[in-house]
Interface confidence: low
């Protein structure tokens, strides 16, 4: 469907509000260090230009591609060279190389201050004084910190953000109303960002075949009553949407996502009985709801898979004729029967099946060769089942904080070269799997846990790619997307690691510890724990527990003291000396 003016087409399809929001997100994700006012100026200029093209599609420059228009606009920023260094070199390139260059300079860990939440009254005043600027600021601040955030979904978060302020700034107790809502949005937003980052990594590092395989498995679990052709159509459209968003084509992505939601709602009967309540909602809410919709019930009369995929004499003929389609159908059939399996496990099974067919279809007696293929799946299935069982037992025994600490020790021993802040962030998030998944019924534990771990480990991979320090991490991250988690699980203590020299400064604490929130205190203690393990990688659990218990007691004692700083100055060196002795 070709249009004389792409920018006019998208403006008309999306409407001014969404158009401006998406352009602001796009610019903020590319130029993450630019001040808010600069971005607003650029967005207003692009919007005015788009309006001239809507009025006359033949007007000058209206026929240019969106990449050309947006890239030209970004390259007008005066401080590009000073602020971004070599990213400014992108502007010397032609499209499509220029956009690729901007994409490569997206920073997953930008050097930006953490967002501080002002007092509720201050926020409510700002909201009432200029609602539009307040909401743009939200889009800008989230987008620049999360350069791969799923843009149409960020518009949905902004709508919820607006609704929270509209409701709570009128309430008798503004804080009691607003703060839980903001906490929820923050936590959901971080989770959404991390999930989308995995989708983009899957597309960018492993290609659209990998993403399509993931989508076939997930959508077949969600829509087990849908036929394969229907699932295929949804997968193709979903792949297009995410390819666009991950590639910075946010207007096309949002437009195509809206079309996909429309298609799904018009074809509910052939997709899922669970879509109805989503389809009554407005666009942003509808798309979100469809993405999160629960699995439909499995058809009651599904036959055994063995007939078509093991017992049939035509397996090799069917496989040879259209390999991807045959494997896609296998994955579809397996996934719709197994909502209790993680997507990653299903993909491992499909990979194992493919490897067996590649080997057996070249053998003298193919049928004899692949007859036991389903038996080979058993260890692949049992590995994540056992992992989830063991870790949930540990979580229930220790509670979240101590479970995180156990994972911190485990992962620091596996990959001690990784930076301490990264190990703390990743291990804390790995530890959240307990509260998120272990309370679920057995049939939902594995998909919850393993697919969540895949998202968290992708964050480790993304951060490590920026500053590679460990060959083991590189190997686990790059060899196979579906085997990342088993690869990390299988890592042992790094025997080649030279322990970090002891640095007393790392273990010196001050009275400011006492004013920290509970979460910040935990992070401080966990940072110290990682440093301890880096110093003594072979320390036993008991030794580390003893040091951490002493640490907690020392901090508690000094925070109760009249002269807190004096207590830290006096007790700190004693704690350090005792810790060194305990770990000797």
């Amino acid at each position: 469907d070709t249009h004389k003016s792409e920018v006019a087409h998208r403006f008309k399809d999306l409407g001014e509000e969404h158009f401006k929001g998406l352009v602001l997100v796009a610019f903020s994700q590319y130029l993450q260090q630019c001040p808010f006012e600069e971005h607003v100026k650029l967005v207003n200029e692009v919007t005015e230009f788009a309006k001239t093209c809507v009025a006359d599609e033949s007007a000058e420059n209206c026929d240019k591609s969106l990449h050309t228009l947006f890239g030209d606009k970004l390259c007008t920023v005066a401080t590009l060279r000073e602020t971004y260094g070599e990213m400014a070199d992108c502007c010397a390139k032609q499209e499509p190389e220029r956009n690729e260059c901007f994409l490569q300079h997206k920073d997953d860990n930008p050097n930006l201050p953490p967002l501080v939440r002002p007092e509720v009254d201050v926020m409510c005043t700002a909201f009432h004084d200029n609602e539009a600027t307040f909401l743009k600021k939200y889009l800008y601040e989230v987008a620049r910190r999360h350069p791969y955030f799923y843009a149409p979904e960020l518009l949905f978060f902004a709508a919820r953000y607006k609704a929270a302020f509209a409701e709570c700034c009128q309430a008798a107790d503004k804080a009691a109303c607003l703060l839980p809502k903001l906490d929820e949005l923050r936590d959901e937003g971080k989770a959404s960002s991390a999930k989308q980052r995995l989708k983009c990594a899957s597309l960018q590092k492993f290609g659209d075949r990998a993403f399509k395989a993931w989508a076939v498995a997930r959508l077949s679990q969600k829509f087990p009553k849908a036929e394969f052709a229907e699932v295929s159509k949804l997968v193709t459209d979903l792949t297009k949407v995410h390819t666009e968003c991950c590639h910075g084509d946010l207007l096309e992505c949002a437009d195509d996502r809206a079309d996909l939601a429309k298609y799904m709602c018009e074809n509910q009967d052939s997709i899922s009985s669970k879509l109805k309540e989503c389809c009554d909602k407005p666009l942003l809410e509808k798309s979100h709801c469809l993405a999160e919709v629960e699995n439909d019930e499995m058809p009651a009369d599904l036959p055994s898979l063995a007939a078509d995929y093991v017992e049939s004499k035509d397996v090799c003929k069917n496989y040879a004729e259209a390999k991807d389609v045959f494997l896609g159908m296998f994955l579809y059939e397996y996934a719709r029967r197994h909502p209790d399996y993680s997507v990653m496990l299903l993909l491992r099974l499909a990979k194992a099946y493919e490897a067996t067919l590649e080997k057996c279809c070249a053998a003298a007696d193919p049928h004899e060769c692949y007859a036991k293929v389903f038996d080979e799946f058993q260890p692949l299935v049992e590995e994540p089942q056992n992992l989830v069982k063991q870790n949930c037992e540990l979580f229930e025994q220790l509670g979240e904080y101590k479970f995180q600490n156990a994972l911190l020790v485990r992962y620091t021993k596996k990959v001690p070269q990784v930076s301490t802040p990264t190990l703390v962030e990743v291990s804390r998030n790995l530890g959240k799997v307990g509260a998120k998944c272990c309370k679920l019924p057995e049939a939902k534990r594995m998909p919850c846990a393993e697919d969540y771990l895949s998202v968290v480990l992708n964050r480790l991979c993304v951060l490590h790619e920026k500053t590679p320090v460990s060959e083991k991490v590189t190997k686990c991250c790059t060899e196979s997307l579906v085997n990342r988690r088993p690869c990390f699980s299988a890592l042992e203590l790094d025997e080649a690691y030279v322990p970090k020299a002891f640095n007393a400064e790392t273990f010196t604490f001050h009275a400011d510890m006492c004013t920290l929130s509970e979460k910040e205190k935990q992070v401080k203690k966990q940072t110290a724990l990682v440093e301890l393990v880096k110093h003594k990688p072979k320390a036993t659990k008991e030794q580390l527990k003893g040091v951490m218990d002493n640490f907690a007691a020392f901090v508690e004692k000094c925070c109760k003291a009249d002269d807190k700083e004096a207590c830290f100055a006096e007790e700190g060196p004693k704690f350090v000396a005792a810790s060194q002795a305990a770990l000797a």
């Epitope: 052709a229 295929s232 159509k233 193709t236 297009k240 003929k317 004729e321 259209a322 389609v325 159908m329």
Partner: nanobody
């Protein structure tokens, strides 16, 4: 470069049948997935049916399932679409398409070559 030429369209009454043909030239026909798409006046092009290289896999849109049948004859480099129990809403320009590397048969942008279309009008 594959050339595709559709034929067999026409004006029929509701409930009637038609058989569309699509003759291919310029490529190794048996290596292509073949598909039929249609576009009604003022509407977007939509998937109708597709068939794999050796006719093992066939796909149909829900709206035509049970009424339309796709087939191919690799020796004649031709793909067919049998249209039965035609309805007024089947009125459209029917396009034949060929794809060398498609994984998923239902998306028009995965097809590399297209015919000019043959018009089917169902009217009483």
């Amino acid at each position: 470069e594959v050339q595709l030429v559709e034929s067999g369209g026409g004006v029929v009454q509701p409930g009637d049948s038609l058989r569309l043909s699509c003759a291919a030239s310029g490529g190794t026909f048996s290596t292509y997935v073949m598909g039929w798409f249609r576009q009604a006046p003022g509407k977007e092009r939509e998937f109708v049916s597709a068939i794999s290289q050796n006719s093992i896999h066939t796909y149909y849109a829900n709206s035509v399932k049970g009424r339309f049948t796709i087939s191919r004859d690799n020796s004649k480099n031709t793909v067919y679409l049998q249209l039965n129990s035609l309805r007024p809403e089947d009125t459209a320009l029917y396009y034949c398409a060929a794809s060398r590397f498609t994984s998923w048969y239902t998306a028009d942008y995965e097809y590399d070559y297209w015919g000019q279309g043959t018009l089917v009008t169902v009217s009483s």
